[in-house]
């Protein structure tokens, strides 16, 4: 759960610890000054993109040692009652489709950070969410029918995907595996819309890591 | 420099094809969408196609849907507008150009090429 | 479609004269969707104005715009030889983006 304080911290990447580096030699440095944060991720960023891999290296090696630690953490972790533990997610299983929203996103992400290198992930997000609301209803559409088409072809991916694990479930018939369905989809729909803000989170981290512009 | 520089044009009979190029230097190319715009013979500006940064999304303007295909290879930094089914009221200067989004200012096109001459007559 | 009327068609003035050109929306237009283009004999059109009133780089402040929902002003305080031209306004509201016939600027 969010609040539970006997939750494991959750991975760093190489970059996050990089940061974390450079704020700390900042505070050295100056005790008493207050930090734009700003201006200090664009120059953490910009100096991230000037350092040769054996320099990254370090900071790989810290996540890499974080991940483990994470890892091994969670394994003995029990979250405490009444939260649902997460299931356990098939890789196989197929992917939730994205919003349009979603798909928006992934095709102005590397405008945004191209013309804004410094910006945290936070502010690229609220910059794109700016520009999506800044998009006219008409031009919103070829985004909705991608992502219309794309929830169509999860819907019967998925079906054909729960009947595959299921072998019984075509002698028990399709009604009661239509009211378990709807069900387990509401479940589903909460569990996949965390993993989507994981994996943009992810997503944002790696491109703040090979951020490139001319 | 930022620029654009427009190919293809030329004079092409009713019914026929034409392809536009549109090459961009000087900006990251990849990172924006892209127009053409048209201009008739002493005429105003009439705006024809989108296309998203990746290519994946385009749009047009119903006097071409169907006609015109709008592309763009963003290894070579290169935009295409391909006409078919060509008419004499496709006869203008095209245009292609950067949109450019201002934050909440909102969008404009900012860089404009040369133009290139479309003329389709018998 | 949202309509873009620009009035007058043409206006006629002298260098260091004020000129104000018009620009009517059909309907409402947001003021981050409109934008104003020059445009010289033979040239492609040059972006003055967005956002309705923020001058794009390089634009002298004897440009400016004004105006919101359906009415719109571009305002050149003092005119130059060089500003004698063809100006575009500019709406999106739609995909459609529609520019108006245009106002010719001409010297007395």
């Known amino acids: 759960g969010k609040g539970d304080p006997k939750k494991p911290r959750g991975k760093m990447s190489s970059y996050a610890f990089f940061v974390q580096t450079c704020r700390e030699e900042h505070k050295k440095k100056h005790p008493d000054a207050s930090v734009n944060f700003s201006e200090f991720s664009k120059k953490c960023s910009e100096r991230w993109k000037t350092m040769s891999a054996k320099e990254k290296g370090k900071f790989e090696d810290m996540a890499k040692a974080d991940k483990a630690r994470y890892e091994r953490e969670m394994k003995t972790y029990i979250p405490p009652k009444g939260e649902t533990k997460k299931k356990f997610k098939d890789p196989n299983a197929p992917k939730r489709p994205p919003s349009a929203f979603f798909l928006f996103c992934s095709e102005y992400r590397p405008k945004i950070k191209g013309e804004h290198p410094g910006l945290s992930i936070g502010d690229v997000a609220k910059k794109l969410g700016e520009m999506w609301n800044n998009t006219a209803a008409d031009d919103k559409q070829p985004y909705e029918k991608k992502a219309a088409k794309l929830k169509e072809k999860y819907e019967k991916d998925i079906a054909a995907y729960r009947a595959k694990g299921k072998p019984d479930a075509a002698k028990k018939g399709v009604v009661k595996a239509e009211k378990s369905k709807k069900k387990k989809e509401e479940e589903e729909d909460e569990e996949d819309e965390e993993d989507e803000e994981e994996e943009e989170d992810e997503e944002d981290e790696e491109e703040e890591e090979d951020d490139d512009d001319e | 420099e930022v620029q654009l520089l427009e190919s293809g044009g030329g004079l092409v009979q009713p019914g026929g094809s034409l392809r536009l190029s549109c090459a961009a230097s000087?900006?990251?190319?990849?990172?924006?969408?892209m127009f053409w715009v048209r201009q008739a013979p002493g005429k105003g500006l009439e705006w024809v196609s989108r296309?998203?940064?990746?290519?994946?999304?385009?749009y047009y303007a119903d006097s071409v849907k169907g006609r015109f295909t709008i592309s763009r290879d963003n290894s070579k930094n290169t935009l295409y507008l391909q006409m078919n089914s060509l008419r004499a009221e496709d006869t203008a200067v095209y245009y292609c150009?950067?949109?450019?989004?201002?934050?909440?200012?909102?969008?404009?096109?900012?860089?404009w090429g040369q133009g290139t001459m479309v003329t389709v007559s018998s | 479609d949202i309509q873009m009327t620009q009035s007058p068609g043409t206006l006629s003035l002298s260098p260091g004269e004020r000129a104000t050109l018009s620009c009517r929306a059909s309907?409402?237009?947001?003021?981050?969707?409109l934008a104003w283009y020059q445009q010289k004999p033979g040239q492609a059109p040059r972006l003055l104005i967005y956002?309705?009133?923020t001058r794009a780089t390089g634009i002298p402040d004897r440009f400016s715009g004004s105006g919101s929902g359906t009415d719109f002003t571009l305002t050149i305080s003092r005119l130059e030889p060089e500003d004698f031209a063809v100006y575009y306004c500019q709406q999106y509201g739609t995909s459609r983006w529609t520019f108006g016939q245009g106002t010719k600027v001409e010297i007395k």
């Open positions: 150009a950067r949109l450019r989004y201002f934050d909440s200012r909102g969008y404009a096109f900012d860089i």
């Open positions: 956002g309705a009133s």
């Open positions: 296309i998203s940064p990746s290519g994946g999304y385009t």
């Open positions: 000087g900006f990251t190319f990849s990172s924006y969408d």
């Open positions: 309907q409402s237009v947001r003021s981050s969707y």
